[in-house]
Interface confidence: low
Amino acid sequence: AVDLTLLANLRLTDPQRFFLTCVSGEAGAGRGSDAWGPPLLLEKDDRIVRTPPGPPLRLARNGSHQVTLRGFSKPSDLVGVFSCVGGAGARRTRVIYVHNSPGAHLLPDKVTHTVNKGDTAVLSARVHKEKQTDVIWKSNGSYFYTLDWHEAQDGRFLLQLPNVQPPSSGIYSATYLEASPLGSAFFRLIVRGCGAGRWGPGCTKECPGCLHGGVCHDHDGECVCPPGFTGTRCEQACREGRFGQSCQEQCPGISGCRGLTFCLPDPYGCSCGSGWRGSQCQEACAPGHFGADCRLQCQCQNGGTCDRFSGCVCPSGWHGVHCEKSDRIPQILNMASELEFNLETMPRINCAAAGNPFPVRGSIELRKPDGTVLLSTKAIVEPEKTTAEFEVPRLVLADSGFWECRVSTSGGQDSRRFKVNVKVPPVPLAAPRLLTKQSRQLVVSPLVSFSGDGPISTVRLHYRPQDSTMDWSTIVVDPSENVTLMNLRPKTGYSVRVQLSRPGEGGEGAWGPPTLMTTDCPEPLLQPWLEGWHVEGTDRLRVSWSLPLVPGPLVGDGFLLRLWDGTRGQERRENVSSPQARTALLTGLTPGTHYQLDVQLYHCTLLGPASPPAHVLLPPSGPPAPRHLHAQALSDSEIQLTWKHPEALPGPISKYVVEVQVAGGAGDPLWIDVDRPEETSTIIRGLNASTRYLFRMRASIQGLGDWSNTVEESTLGNGLQAEGPVQESRAAEEGLDQ
């Protein structure tokens, strides 16, 4: 069974001091066999017993092993069902605690009832505050039965449930008609899936005979031991104030386990700790009684004395539950109640015995679950005991179960059963996961799902260059941490595999499947500098940069240019794939936009440091192009241009710009402003005779717009050489915009 205990502090004078604590003694609590398992959950279950809403309860975690619920403000907060859930996967287990109000009209004589399939269960509700109304019994919140108020027997209302079956399990309540549900007596009925002393799928297996009030689990045949007892059959008492499957937990506070209710996995239910009884677990056991709820009687013989926590304490020369066995009868000493080994190992098991006559090697034997008897290969004889050592053949899964050490002498015989768990070493089902990579290191998550048994004690990571025949390098890591493989070669593929181990000899599992992880190439370290930039249009920008001069080859594959448009929150990235490039033309930008620009060297997927940024403002986009531009020669020095205004203008045109260029000429074009935007014609003067010219024009609003189509026209012949073209109107005031 899962080692899970729900503790309720029943010192109820002040609800604010009330708390519930759930404690897990599981190895690696919070760890499932697939990776990290689910945490402990502790909550109030309002499905059956609903209480008025109050302030939320406070949950405090103490590591993965303990969780505490506090913050109860009034007594009614306490009434109802609380549950703790722990364990992982198929072992996930719910422990339930039912709390009754001490001031209720009806109180349960006993809250938890564990019965066997087919038994008759009797729930008894004691009258605490009498009302002369009927009593309603409910099962899991639904109406079940009614008793007339005068059917009380000796101040109690009894509900008899004959021939109970597992579906009858649940929360039962007895409530006076028309009384508050908080005044009910709440019970918990647990019906084992088998008859008394049996367990297993068809109830064909025999329970081990649980001692000291332990309850045989109907699924796995294990004893769920009362708080304060341990061992395969609950045969050993813990020291006072201790609980848990291995007595590993300690009751809080100076008065030990007084005032605490302990709830354990079904089919045990809840009880006081060992040595205590009463509805609030505050009364010590009466003389001659011991154990949880003081349900056990000592009946010590041969001068034994009764200890309320552990039972009979025998005088020298006697042993046994009731001190009924003479020390002359042989006795198995200090045999562990449970042993764990790994599959296919060949462990040595020791069994020590004392007695008179003294046990010898041949008088001690070991019996496996299949009935095979092993004889000891060696015995160590000491004055007070003989220890026989058994060499166990290679273990198989079928060896899991109850083994028995038996000693026989002429003085009698003794035997001790103990449980052997054969565990399967874990084997990874998946390859490790690459988290990050650099040029000389890989960061790997080694924790993968696995077959076989946990807990994982060590994780080995094996790695070597891909397709290499060299020996594997191995690193042993903590199961819960990511691993950094150091001192690797850059730009190299590595085969990486996980090997998991569980505790104990032979706990190493087979290697898991490999995965290929490739180191990055060296990080580029040079920082470029933006040398200059100029606008080549409303949406085009030419950028140039330089790199510091350093000796040796350039480490880099190219450059990344980044333009950040802060207004729109957009980033544009331009990849320049040559490490030799020092200039780039960026096109398709948004006119009228303020950009932040920087450049970085890259190598593989790694980026070097960015250049200091530049801030560039692109001019706003202008209007569309003028339409139907036409040129007509007027003389040997004049050509008239006519056009139509652009369509769909975003605003009033401020001017037109005319570009004039000699056809086939190598010189720069001349730009002439037409400052009267309402005009649709102009005469260009001062041209050379018999010369062919090219004309195009564009409009301007806030920025220059698109160029029109280009037109050609020749001046007429026989003119003189002119000084240069000018526009007809206000020609003297016009400058040529180069």
Partner: antibody, heavy 120, light 107 residues
Framework: EVQLLESGGGLVQPGGSLRLSCAAS????????MVWVRQAPGKGLEWVSV????????GYADSVKGRFTISRDNSKNTLYLQVNSLRAEDTAVYYC?????????????WGQGTLVTVSS | DIQMTQSPSSLSASVGDRVTITCRAS??????LAWYQQKPGKVPKLLIY???TLQSGVPSRFSGSGSGTDFTLTISSLQPEDVATYYC?????????FGQGTRLEIK
Amino acid sequence: EVQLLESGGGLVQPGGSLRLSCAASGFTFSMYGMVWVRQAPGKGLEWVSVISPSGGNTGYADSVKGRFTISRDNSKNTLYLQVNSLRAEDTAVYYCARAPRGYSYGYYYWGQGTLVTVSS
Amino acid sequence: DIQMTQSPSSLSASVGDRVTITCRASQGIGHYLAWYQQKPGKVPKLLIYTASTLQSGVPSRFSGSGSGTDFTLTISSLQPEDVATYYCQQFNSYPHTFGQGTRLEIK
């Protein structure tokens, strides 16, 4: 003797659902990963899904991701495949197989398969 | 996902011939490759695992070789009962993809 027995196949309309089961016996079911593989009529084998021994980890082929769900009940030694939003191209024989547990990477144990036909 | 490509798609050979089927992975998979034989109406049968290890009970005329990206299944002397479709499957990373299959017939 290891045995895997699939069931739950049949004729279903496009967009419909089925739940395929695979009952396992003859080995400790809770110690092995399990997989589903399918084979369309006259076509090759297609790997569909995997689940780890405890059921805590699953994986799917891209072609079924979001529509199929693999699960298992170790107490019943049974593997399941819930198939939703079925399409004509999901018509196939669905096999369950036992995943390997160590160095021997290969599927040695297969079920006999169950046929799923998606047609209107 | 890793793609597995088998060649040829089908082949016809005579009894006693040496037959070779190849399988290529789209990226390195070490030696994590299995070969299966499937006869009409039957379930696949594991022949070879980890590229070259013969599954117990499989006739020794079957052998496998290769690692990384290129793998070969060889039948040293073809027998009538070897008529089947043969598949490769990678186990290096999920999904554990299969090749498209090679149909083998007797001439």
